[in-house]
Interface confidence: medium
């Protein structure tokens, strides 16, 4: 009823002292190699001369940090990044960073990278609204503090401020065009 040699599992390493013979009921815990993380139970148990349990180690590393336009990576570059490792970016002049300067490898995926935007605080086209339009011809770029007005299509009523303003590269909240209640 004893068990002999320990079973081997990909990227899993048995902990403790290796023995020639394991008694029935004895448990052995495995740990994962660098870059790998245990998925589920980490032990095997000796039952009736056989080992039960199957520790599974999955790769949680990341490769190729996200590319950020107008930025470069200032931390050391690696071919493979373990989960929890961070990578730091810096924007090229005259761009300004929106988002945190670091991304983190989180169980095989990178967190959202920052953006490097034109620091002048310009805005893109105003946001579209349902059943309404802006009253002026839309431009691709708007200067800081510039504003536009919305109007609703026939039979729709405007709720909120009809004028929105560009501030810090972001438009203020646009109005809504609501269908009037029919009584």
């Amino acid at each position: 009823t004893d068990c002999l040699s320990l079973p081997s599992f990909e990227n899993a390493i048995p902990m403790g002292e290796k023995k020639d013979v394991y008694k029935a009921g004895e448990q052995v815990t495995y740990t994962c190699a660098t870059y790998y993380k245990m998925d589920g139970a980490s032990n095997v148990t000796c039952i009736n001369s056989r080992w039960t349990g199957r520790p599974t180690c999955r790769d949680t590393s990341c490769v190729n940090p996200p590319t950020v336009q107008n930025a470069y990576i200032v931390s050391r570059q690696m071919s493979k990044y373990p989960s929890g490792e961070r990578v730091r970016y810096q924007c090229r002049s005259p761009y300004e960073m929106f988002g945190d300067e670091e991304v983190m490898c989180l169980n095989g995926n990178w967190t959202e990278p920052p953006q490097c935007k034109d620091s002048t605080g310009k805005c893109g086209p105003p946001p579209p609204i349902d059943n309404g339009d802006i009253t002026s011809f839309p431009l691709s770029v708007y200067a800081p503090a510039s504003s536009v007005e919305y109007q609703c299509q026939n039979l729709y009523q405007l709720e909120g401020n009809k004028r929105i303003t560009c501030r810090n590269g972001q438009w203020s909240e646009p109005p809504k065009c609501l269908h009037p209640c029919v009584i």
Partner: antibody
Framework: QVQLKQSGPGLVQPSQSLSITCTVS????????VHWVRQSPGKGLEWLGV???????EYNAAFMSRLTITKDNSKSQVFFKMNSLLVDDTGIYYC???????????WGQGTSVTVSS | QIVLSQSPAILSASPGEKVTMTCRAS?????MHWYQQKAGSSPTAWIF???NLASGVPPRFSGSGSGTSYSLTISRVEAEDAATYYC?????????FGAGTKLELK
């Protein structure tokens, strides 16, 4: 350990402004952004805005016209100011550290704000 | 902005039971995060980016989902899990939160 401690008034008159200071410890504001979130019985949790490690800000468009977030890296302090308060702005205001993907991993203890005359 | 609908609003479970709560988004989202909040306390980070448990969260918790439908599952509920759980999306600005699922223990 990482902490965010908030200080600010509990009672604000309508049309007045609200100022809250968030003092952080065990991490640097030059590395991490700080978000502001509020919680009220009527509207639940609402994201108000964030100041990033580089000092740039993003605001919820619904609050943008009356909200300003600034910071002093050397003092490890983030400052929140909201103007023209309404009774509707009553709630608990939290500062919280950015983790990534606009999630937060550590929250301040909250500042309970009542807007009333 | 994206609206997140959490169901059920109140979930009653016995210790040892398996429970699942869901969060549905009005449009597809890139990331879903979960927070736990106990009465009188600040929220606590619980699950990041759909399925990554925050530091100190017991492995009986798991998260899954994609697109517009996400869920948080507790394999065997314990008394200390009684709290309100909120989902939060990121992908479309502004980030928004669900109204919460309150987990009560029988």
């Amino acid at each position: 350990q990482v902490q965010l401690k908030q200080s600010g008034p509990g009672l604000v008159q309508p049309s007045q402004s609200l100022s809250i200071t968030c003092t952080v410890s065990d991490f640097s504001l030059t590395n991490s952004g700080v978000h502001w979130v509020r919680q009220s019985p009527g509207k639940g949790l609402e994201w108000l805005g964030v100041i990033w490690s580089g000092g740039t800000t993003e605001y919820n468009a619904a609050f943008m016209s009356r909200l300003t977030i600034t910071k002093d890296n050397s003092k490890s302090q983030v400052f929140f100011k909201m103007n023209s308060l309404l009774v509707d702005d009553t709630g608990i205001y939290y500062c919280a550290r950015n983790f990534g993907n606009y999630a937060v991993d550590y929250w301040g203890q909250g500042t309970s704000v009542t807007v009333s005359s | 902005q994206i609206v997140l609908s959490q169901s059920p609003a109140i979930l009653s479970a016995s210790p040892g039971e398996k429970v699942t709560m869901t969060c549905r988004a009005s449009s597809s989202v890139r990331y879903m995060h979960w927070y736990q909040q106990k009465a009188g306390s600040s929220p606590t980070a619980w699950i990041f980016a759909t399925s990554n448990l925050a530091s100190g969260v017991p492995p009986r918790f798991s998260g899954s989902g994609s697109g517009t439908s996400y869920s948080l599952t507790i394999s065997r509920v314990e008394a200390e899990d009684a709290a309100t759980y909120y989902c939060q999306q990121w992908g479309t600005k502004p980030p928004t939160f669900g109204a919460g699922t309150k987990l009560e223990l029988k």
